[in-house]
């Protein structure tokens, strides 16, 4: 359920508020609907950077749970093959705040277009 993914993103934003994490993360800020699965996979990969950088058990657990929920939601859509989409490394690097903002935006796109 994508709303549960949103809920975990809210938890992560709450948890990182008091931390100083300097990492920049590959961020897709303008997702084309035909590339949303590819973009989501990039977001999930980059999320693990936050988990590692924070060194926080609560963030680690929440990230782990979010990835499981998101992968379950993606697999329920069946095996979607997308072509012509950007590789993660081609995306713009943004700070954590902007990354999470764009992450919420793409999850909302999955909800809105389901």
């Amino acid at each position: 359920n994508w709303v549960n993914v949103i809920s975990d993103l809210k938890k992560i934003e709450d948890l990182i508020q008091s931390m100083h994490i300097d990492a920049t993360l590959y961020t897709e800020s303008d997702v084309h609907p035909s590339c949303k699965v590819t973009a989501m996979k990039c977001f999930l990969l980059e999320l693990q950077v936050i988990s590692l950088e924070s060194g926080d058990a609560s963030i680690h657990d929440t990230v782990e749970n979010l990835i499981i929920l998101a992968n379950n939601s993606l697999s329920s859509n069946g095996n979607v093959t997308e072509s012509g989409c950007k590789e993660c490394e081609e995306l713009e690097e943004k700070n954590i705040k902007e990354f999470l903002q764009s992450f919420v935006h793409i999850v909302q796109m999955f909800i809105n277009t389901s």
Epitope: V3, E13, D14, S29, H105, M109, I111
Partner: antibody, heavy 119, light 108 residues
Amino acid sequence: QVQLQESGPGLVKPSGTLSLTCAVSGGSISSSNWWSWVRQPPGKGLEWIGEIYHYGYTNYNPSLKSRVTISVDKSKNQFSLKLSSVTAADTAVYYCAREGIGWPSFDYWGQGTLVTVSS
Amino acid sequence: SSELTQDPAASVALGQTVRITCQGDTLRSYYASWYQQKPGQAPILVIYGKNNRPSGIPDRFSGSSSGNTASLTITGAQAEDEADYYCNSRDESGKNLVFGGGTKLTVL
């Protein structure tokens, strides 16, 4: 600075169709944002009507869904609202608004236009 | 329920602090945003996300969230803060946007 401007008839007859257009300037309707219509009956609170994304995706308030159509015209940088089978209860100030990226918010609003349903 | 509940009215003495609340189950998953609306004017976004202020919004406005409740705090209320305040979020399906019923703030 993004600006939104609603236009359309200020008076609609009962059982008729309310039609409004929102012209977007200072920004592109083909941005990553969703675009919404919100209304406010006189002396009452705000009610979300529906939203559209420039690729044509729409979502509507379940209580209005059977009567609402929102469309987008990218060539004119505008989006439109149609509300059918109107009654006096649809009399309200109608606002168009741009949704922010990420968490729910409306970061830019039109000034609003009063639509009265009366014969 | 996907409703957002606000107290209809609140008051604050000039220069004092007031907190306006918004309750709803959906706020466990989503942050709320807050709008100020003065008579005859369109709403203005004052707080969004965890606690973000758009440019031009005074820093006396702040937002917070706990459980199923979102709060807007005005620290050192000014006469010009007298207005209606609305919260906004998504419903529990995530698909639909919803508003609270609004709180009319009077500055005494």
